[in-house]
């Protein structure tokens, strides 16, 4: 939270590739690769749908919503077994992210 961005300074991330493809069910799958230089006590995560360095505690405890991974106006919920999270848009559309 509130750490500086720049030429990949400590505590920052940059998107390296962003691939979009469709599987047989015509379901869009986005694969985003990011490069992060996180500080001690931090680890690469997602904030406001973008790569970010987040507290390692969040990853260890799988409290994914503490990263604020969803966009403003969306609601965040943990998936069963904390295997990921869902972002629910105001219109009811749900975007699911699983962590592997």
């Amino acid at each position: 939270q509130f750490l500086k961005e720049g030429q990949l300074a400590a505590g920052t991330c940059e998107i390296v590739t962003l691939d979009r493809c469709c599987n047989k069910n015509r379901r869009t799958i986005a694969r985003q690769t990011a490069r992060c230089a996180c500080r001690k006590g931090q680890i690469a995560g997602t904030t406001r749908a973008r790569p970010a360095c987040v507290d390692a505690r969040i990853i260890k405890t799988k409290q994914w919503c503490d990263m604020l991974p969803c966009l403003e106006g969306e609601g965040c919920d943990l998936l069963i077994n904390r295997s990921g999270w869902t972002c629910t848009q105001p219109g009811g559309r749900i975007k699911t992210t699983t962590v592997s």
Epitope: Q1, T47, C87
Partner: antibody, heavy 113, light 110 residues
């Protein structure tokens, strides 16, 4: 989207007091919520923060003196054992990695014997 | 313990430009935010991440940061800009997370 604090009143020293911040028009699951106070004629003082999971962090000076908890649309601040130095206007604020962009109007707590 | 230092009071003539500064050891690696507070009102976020302005904030307000100093610049000061201005930043992560406000600067427009 709005925040409103309630529960501020005159209390005697040592009497626990709970303030409530009610959120309208947005989900607490996608923001950080903080409590900030301001003594009369003084500056802003951050008390603590609650994450969507319910994890809390407190200012060093506030540890043990305050407890923050959250429900579906409310965030509570309990002043465990108020002293006269806790007389202030208490604000709740909604934040993310961009700062605290939404504040309640505040609620006044007066601690006096 | 993180301390943000601001000048207690600053005076500016109507229509002139004024710069308010905030210094701290950690501002070279942590973002600064700026808040405006008028008497009897809640604070309003003016600047976040050193330089960004939320929608609705006039472009007369701008932020910058260099080294350990963050600066809020108000161009063409108006009577309505008379208020207290607070800088703030966060420090640490995990169990050490803290958010700190500066002591505030009282701006008077004459």
């Amino acid at each position: 989207q709005s925040l409103e604090e309630s529960g501020g009143r005159l209390v005697t020293p040592g009497t626990p007091l709970t303030l409530t911040c009610t959120a309208s028009g947005f989900s607490l699951s996608t923001y950080y919520m903080s409590w900030v106070r301001q003594a009369p004629g003084k500056g802003l003082e951050w008390i603590g923060i609650v994450y969507p999971s319910g994890t809390t962090y407190y200012a060093n000076w506030a540890k043990g003196r305050f407890t923050i908890s959250t429900a579906s649309t409310t965030v509570d601040l309990m002043i465990t054992s108020p002293t006269t130095e806790d007389t202030a206007t208490y604000f709740c604020a909604r934040g993310d990695s961009f700062g605290y962009g939404l504040w309640g109007p505040g609620t006044l707590v007066t601690v006096s014997s | 313990e993180l301390v943000l230092t601001q000048s207690p009071s600053v005076q500016v003539n109507l229509g002139q430009t004024v710069s308010l500064t905030c210094t701290a050891d950690t501002l070279s690696r942590s973002y600064a935010s700026w808040y405006q507070q008028k008497p009897g009102q809640a604070p309003v976020l003016l600047i976040y991440r050193d330089t960004s302005r939320p929608s609705g904030v006039p472009d007369r307000f701008s932020g910058s940061s260099s080294g350990n100093t963050a600066t809020l610049t108000i161009s063409g000061a108006q009577a309505g800009d008379e208020a207290d201005y607070y800088c703030a930043t966060s420090d640490g992560s995990g169990s050490n997370y803290q958010y700190v406000f500066g002591g505030g600067t009282q701006l008077t427009v004459t």
